[in-house]
Amino acid sequence: SGTTNTVAAYNLTWKSTNFKTILEWEPKPVNQVYTVQISTKSGDWKSKCFYTTDTECDLTDEIVKDVKQTYLARVFSYPAGNVESTGSAGEPLYENSPEFTPYLETNLGQPTIQSFEQVGTKVNVTVEDERTLVRRNNTFLSLRDVFGKDLIYTLYYWKSSSSGKKTAKTNTNEFLIDVDKGENYCFSVQAVIPSRTVNRKSTDSPVECMGQEKGEFREI
């Protein structure tokens, strides 16, 4: 059963990057408002974003409580504003979201190369360990803290003077690669979770090249 003057939400979509998680839906409301509820498969429905005219709801605070749980959300529609109404007609209309498991589905954010250091024919490239909104003991965990060895980084590197790319992989946040003496190199990294079936890879980081600010060079 539903309420006159309202339409159900549709196109419920999870938008999640590094566990920052927003539920989006349509349509833009006309004389109606929305309330969102979120639940784990075994849990209770918790109301969030009460009576909002937005078509999105930030559910990060809820999903970071246990990123390995599977969540379901639903969006309720209520008549509102200066509409003819003589009391509530049963339960409001609602629509369910797809299931969402943050650990398996959150998009990996674009990584950043924190620094690179050349020592002779070796270059150490360090990837910034992005902070997430997942907490443990009142401190925010990094992406590495959350994913551990499930997360790897792929480094793409090439001589500034050529286009032939080489790759390296690490399950830490550091690479140590061999380079030709006297050559400048460019670097880009990508975060990867090989065990995933969806959203396995991030976009590539911005390119950083030797001879620019980020690096430190020590010829030995």
Epitope: K46, S47, F50, Y51, Y78, G81
Partner: antibody, heavy 118, light 106 residues
């Protein structure tokens, strides 16, 4: 049907604490936000804070921060509001109230009168 | 915090008369809620989301408004309507209530 039954009237000394209970029935206690609102004699209403019994998530009005603690016991379907460092201005009727259709203050307890007097 | 100012504080009217209660917000809010309270009783939800009558509220009641100005209207007062009415907002934290309008029998 939804019922919220509150504990009886209390008389307290300034500086002491009071703990008011609100026993819920007729619904799944852990699935709904519970709010506390008070009304001083002859005055308007004031939101104190809220709790989601499912996970203990709570929020408080800054005016009461540090003096109020709202808890919930899922095993007995009871919410509690404890107010400390009482002063005469805290004399009021305290209500628990639950979210419902189209309204966050949809169902109300009968109220508990707390009198703070020396 | 949002301050809600209700006017008048007291209305003395006879049964059958029309009553319009006003609620003015210190900043624009999305929706207004109204509660009816009788002596020695808890408030009861009366109008929600500006214009929706709560369950069991007679059709002689209506609510409207937007932004900072909202109103509750009783088209023809009946004996059971004499009570105090409070407006309330939760567009911004903390939720706040107006000081109330008492509708008494003239």
């Amino acid at each position: 049907q939804v019922q919220l039954v509150q504990s009886g009237a209390e008389v307290k000394r300034p500086g002491s604490s009071v703990k008011v209970s609100c026993k819920a029935s007729g619904y799944t206690f852990s699935s709904y936000w519970m709010y506390w609102v008070r009304q001083a004699p002859g005055q308007g209403l004031e939101w104190i804070g809220q709790i989601y019994p499912g996970d203990g998530d709570s929020n408080y009005n800054e005016n009461f921060q540090g003096r109020v603690t709202i808890t919930a016991d899922k095993s007995t379907s009871t919410a509690y509001m404890e107010l400390s460092s009482l002063r005469s201005e805290d004399t009021a009727v305290y209500y628990c109230t639950r979210e419902g259709y189209g309204n966050r203050f949809a169902y109300w307890g009968q109220g508990t009168l707390v009198t703070v007097s020396s | 915090e949002i301050v809600l100012t209700q006017s008048p504080a007291l209305m003395s009217l006879s049964p059958g008369e029309r009553a319009t209660l006003s609620c003015s917000a210190s900043s624009s809010v999305s929706y207004m809620y109204w509660y009816q309270q009788k002596p020695r009783s808890a408030p009861r939800p009366w109008i929600q989301l500006t214009s929706n009558l709560a369950s069991g509220v007679p059709a002689r009641f209506s609510g409207r408004g937007s932004g900072t100005d909202f109103s509750l209207t009783i088209s023809s007062l009946e004996a059971e309507d004499f009570a105090t009415y409070y407006c309330q907002q939760w567009s911004y934290n903390p939720p706040t209530f107006g000081g109330g309008t008492k509708v008494e029998i003239k």
